[in-house]
């Protein structure tokens, strides 16, 4: 049996997909089915993640990399590496302990996940409400009332109608 690797630390050259037992002469062993080692020199192979139930397989496990899961339709991932699946709600709703509930007046959610958030308070920025908010959409803030006075520069002011005999101020 021939090994083609260098003679330094015996474990360092055990490739990904194998594990190393430095108590034995024959050092590298292949990972058994449904296990993996993603780096060389590992002392054990890790059991592949299984995407079951509400999880579905996004990427199959291999001897050198773990499986990756996502969520079945109607659910979305939460946490690092999709460690949890949470039920989707409709836009305009949020998930509570009792299921999906419509956003209260004055709040909105434009996604299938997350919580309802308060509409933007346009007046805090000295602006006025251009488009009213809904359960699914935030308000759209427009220019402040002062911005709409004649002569003031504004993002989208309509051109003031001129009265005969008057010149622009």
């Amino acid at each position: 049996f021939e090994r083609t690797r260098s003679l330094q630390d015996p474990c360092s050259n055990c490739p990904a997909g194998t594990f190393c037992d430095n108590n034995r002469n024959q050092i590298c062993s292949p990972c058994p089915p449904n296990s993996f080692s993603s780096a060389g020199g590992q002392r054990t192979c890790d059991i592949c993640r299984q995407c079951k139930g509400v999880f579905r397989t996004r990427k199959e496990c291999s001897s050198t990399s773990n499986a990756e899961c996502d969520c079945t339709p109607g659910f979305h991932c939460l946490g690092a590496g999709c460690s949890m699946c949470e039920q989707d709600c409709k836009q305009g709703q949020e998930l509570t302990k009792k299921g999906c509930k419509d956003c209260c007046f004055g709040t909105f959610n434009d996604q299938k996940r997350g919580i309802c958030r308060p509409w933007t308070n346009c007046s805090l920025d000295g602006k006025s409400v251009l488009v009213n908010g809904t359960k699914e959409r935030d308000v759209v803030c427009g220019p402040s009332p002062a911005d709409l006075s004649p002569g003031a520069s504004s993002v989208t002011p309509p051109a003031p109608a001129r009265e005969p005999g008057h010149s622009p101020q």
């Epitope: 291999s62 001897s63 990399s65």
Partner: antibody, heavy 114, light 107 residues
Framework: EVQLVESGGGLVQPGGSLRLSCAAS????????MHWVRQAPGKGLEWVAY????????YYADSVKGRFTISRDNAKNSLYLQMNSLRAEDTAMYYC???????WGQGTLLTVSS | EIVMTQSPATLSLSPGERVTLSCKAS??????VSWYQQKPGQAPRLLIY???NRYTGVPARFSGSGSGTDFTLTISSVEPEDLAVYYC?????????FGGGTKLELK
């Protein structure tokens, strides 16, 4: 669906050379080490060679050391076995298998005879 | 190298019988033993890995046990399609080695 398809077998005279190929599909070939295993007619299974996923680590059985060379082309999802100085005792069905040894191809038959 | 020895070489039985196949390793191989089924003209098929884990799609009548040097494959109730040669193999260390096989045939 995982598939491994061997090709390249045939009749060769003693001392001759041949290259076997294994075409892989249905899985991420570049993430798996690969084996060649052979089976002489009416006999048991004999492991021949292993190559790691990236090709950096290679092991051979003593019976083929110095005569056979295992290699792979991850861009082509292909595994190879170059066989030189062939002997009658190399006559066998040659299988490729993933390093989990869970999926095997259907094999390609090598016959070494004069 | 690690030598895997299977017994018996041949087993004659009737459908519905319980059958136990034996595999012994020449040295400790932990639980790194797999069992394969091979029918005439076909490639080997993985049944059991890690001594006792049934591979995907393998019927529940197949089970494996053992660790160290002694391993067993049990078929709880043999079906006609189970008639084949069964090999054990170790992946504890290179070179990977296999037993000589046990042939299951009809009485």
């Amino acid at each position: 669906e995982v598939q491994l398809v061997e090709s390249g077998g045939g009749l060769v005279q003693p001392g001759g050379s041949l290259r076997l190929s294994c075409a892989a599909s249905g899985f991420t070939f570049s993430e798996f080490g690969m084996h060649w295993v052979r089976q002489a007619p009416g006999k048991g299974l004999e492991w021949v060679a292993y190559i790691s996923s990236g090709g950096s680590t290679i092991y051979y059985a003593d019976s083929v050391k110095g005569r056979f060379t295992i290699s792979r082309d991850n861009a082509k999802n292909s595994l190879y076995l170059q066989m030189n100085s062939l002997r009658a005792e190399d006559t066998a069905m040659y299988y490729c298998a993933r390093d989990w040894v869970d999926y095997w191809g259907q094999g390609t038959l090598l016959t070494v005879s004069s | 190298e690690i030598v895997m020895t299977q017994s018996p070489a041949t087993l004659s039985l009737s459908p519905g019988e319980r059958v136990t196949l034996s595999c012994k390793a020449s040295e400790n191989v932990g639980s790194y033993v797999s069992w394969y089924q091979q029918k005439p003209g076909q490639a080997p098929r993985l049944l059991i890995y890690g001594a006792s884990n049934r591979y995907t799609g393998v019927p529940a009548r197949f089970s494996g046990s053992g660790s160290g040097t002694d391993f067993t494959l049990t078929i709880s109730s043999v079906e006609p399609e189970d008639l084949a040669v069964y090999y054990c193999g170790q992946s504890y260390s290179y070179p990977l080695t296999f037993g000589g096989g046990t042939k299951l045939e009809l009485k």
